[in-house]
């Protein structure tokens, strides 16, 4: 059918609660395109009727709620004027046993989000809530080891739990709960978070510094091989991840099928006060679709990008 297949990373989800996935793949979805969702290679599109438990909402697929039998491979087909891309998303649904007040047991959060708080600092946790505009998200409550979090040190602000003067006792199993309202019906979203504590020292304000790139464009010929280093300085005992992303997805996942663009192995040089890290991105063959797209180097909270640009024509 002339559609290019793209395979996204697996999503592992909790049953009996809402879930949504947005079909975005720039630069494809940045222009005039139509998006249609399908399940398990079915020729029949996912319903667009908002009363349906599973339906398409603009570019999103929305499950209200997700159920055990919803596991499978979902495809979204993005059709442009001159292009067609089929994105495959593998959704795995499992039963999650959260705190049952009658049992009083702790939730098993090992497979849920993992977040870090920094000892002695003011820090925060995030409740990740990704839903279309049609979903109104209500007040968020936070729990630690099944008890609602209260106290002067904790402030619930939007999707975050601000924690002042983090202590070792703040490690543990957390959950954030939000009420989602859609078409007059209410649903509960409950996300588990495993929190660990780190003693990161301060270097340059304890924010990793990206030496290169510097948010700039690189002129490169079509079809050539290109390797770009991301150089980062950070504290010796930092816990930051360094990686290359495109469209907020790891490049290795984004180009999982073709492996045309890959992230290299991280190396580092140790200095007295800090480490210098290098992680590269390799374009085995630069294609037209790579131009104008920001390839982001992430280092903790720091980001910097490169944008590939066609060289100006030489009229000599």
């Amino acid at each position: 059918d002339g559609c290019k297949d793209i395979f996204m990373k697996n999503e592992i989800l909790s049953a009996s609660q809402p879930f949504a996935f947005n079909c975005t793949f720039p630069p494809i979805t940045s222009g005039e395109v139509s998006v249609t969702w399908y399940k398990n290679s079915s020729k029949i599109p996912v319903s667009k009727i908002i009363q349906s438990r599973i339906h398409q909402d603009e570019t999103w697929i929305l499950f209200l709620p997700m159920e055990w039998g919803d596991s499978g491979v979902y495809q979204c087909v993005i059709k442009g004027r001159d292009s067609c891309h089929r994105i495959h998303v593998n959704l795995t649904v499992f039963e999650k046993h959260w705190c049952d007040t009658s049992i009083g047991g702790l939730p098993n959060l090992s497979d849920e989000y993992k977040q870090i708080l920094h000892l002695g600092k003011d820090d925060s946790l995030t409740c990740h809530l990704h839903f279309p505009k049609s979903c109104v998200l209500g007040p968020i409550k936070w729990y630690k080891d099944c008890n609602e979090i209260k106290g002067e040190r904790f402030t619930v602000l939007e999707t975050r739990l601000l924690v002042s003067n983090v202590s070792a006792e703040d490690r543990g199993n957390y959950a954030c709960q939000a009420i989602l309202t859609h078409s007059g019906k209410q649903y509960e979203v409950l996300n588990g978070i495993t929190v660990s504590i780190t003693e990161r020292a301060g270097y340059g304000g304890s924010v990793p510094k990206i030496i290169y790139p510097k948010n700039h464009s690189i002129e490169v010929q079509l079809g050539t091989t290109l390797i770009v280093d991301c150089n980062v300085t950070d504290t010796k005992d930092n816990t930051n991840l360094r990686c290359w992303r495109v469209n907020n997805t790891l490049v290795d996942d984004y180009y999982d099928e073709s492996k045309r663009i890959r992230e290299g192995v991280e190396t580092h040089v140790s200095f007295r006060e800090h480490n210098l890290y290098t992680v590269n991105i390799t374009f085995l063959e630069v294609k037209m679709e790579d131009y104008g797209l920001p390839f982001m180097c992430h280092a903790g909270v720091s980001t910097a990008y490169i944008i590939l640009q066609l060289p100006a024509p030489d009229f000599r």
Partner: antibody, heavy 120, light 112 residues
């Protein structure tokens, strides 16, 4: 629609206290923080603190921690901000403000402002 | 406290021309969750402030699309593609990454 209506202008003497009210309507009062921001004449904006009607939780800018008290009357969906030991530099317009939504920050809703003049 | 520094202090613009205001924060406002906790407000004469941009680049409800926000973790820009007479007032940047919430000193925009 969301509306925040504040009490009228006040003139106070140095050392006195002032209590400004902010009556909320058009949303579930107990779901949102109510923020207080002040603006001295020809000056910028200064965040004083915020109050959550559920559990009477207050988070204050340290600059005001000894002088500001925030309270509420749930029956009338009203939040109060009391500033004590007034000095001339407290002369300002005091605003109450509410965030865009429960998960998106930024003050999308503001009261009309209450001018407090401190003068001997 | 996070310090927000705005430039310029004032700006005089011809209607229909573009305008740009800058703001710098003393700490990166880009959170680990990939959200940048940065905002732009406009206070028109005699009115309370109004939200223009939230989370660095999102247009608030009812704000004309001639306004746009961009930036990195510490350096931010508000652009008006074509200034109109109704855009006069004082523009403030703000952060809510952490408490206390802080505002920039303001940039006064007037029409030539």
């Amino acid at each position: 629609q969301v509306q925040l209506v504040q009490s009228g202008a006040e003139v106070k003497k140095p050392g006195a206290s002032v209590k400004v009210s902010c009556k909320a309507s058009g949303y579930t009062f107990t779901n949102y923080w109510m923020n207080w921001v002040r603006q001295a004449p020809r000056q910028g904006l200064e965040w004083m603190g915020m109050f959550h009607p559920t559990g009477d939780v207050t988070r204050l800018n340290q600059k005001f921690k000894d002088r500001v008290t925030m309270t509420r009357d749930t029956s009338t969906s009203t939040v109060y901000m009391e500033l004590s030991s007034l000095r001339s530099e407290d002369t300002a317009v005091y605003y109450c403000a509410r965030t865009t939504s429960m998960i998106i920050g930024g003050f999308a809703y503001w009261g009309q402002g209450t001018l407090v003049t401190v003068s001997s | 406290d996070i310090v927000m520094t705005q430039t310029p202090l004032s700006l005089s613009v011809t209607p229909g021309q573009p305008a740009s205001i800058s703001c710098r924060s003393s700490k990166s406002l880009l959170h680990r969750n990939a959200i940048t906790y940065f905002y732009w407000y406009l206070q028109k004469p005699g009115q309370p402030p109004q939200l223009l941009i939230y989370q660095m680049s999102n247009l608030a409800s009812g704000v004309p699309d001639r306004f746009s926000g961009s930036g990195s973790g510490t350096d931010f820009t508000l652009k008006i593609s074509r200034v109109e007479a109704e855009d006069v007032g004082v523009y403030y940047c703000a952060q809510n990454l952490e408490l206390p919430l802080t505002f920039g000193g303001g940039t006064k925009v007037e029409i030539k």
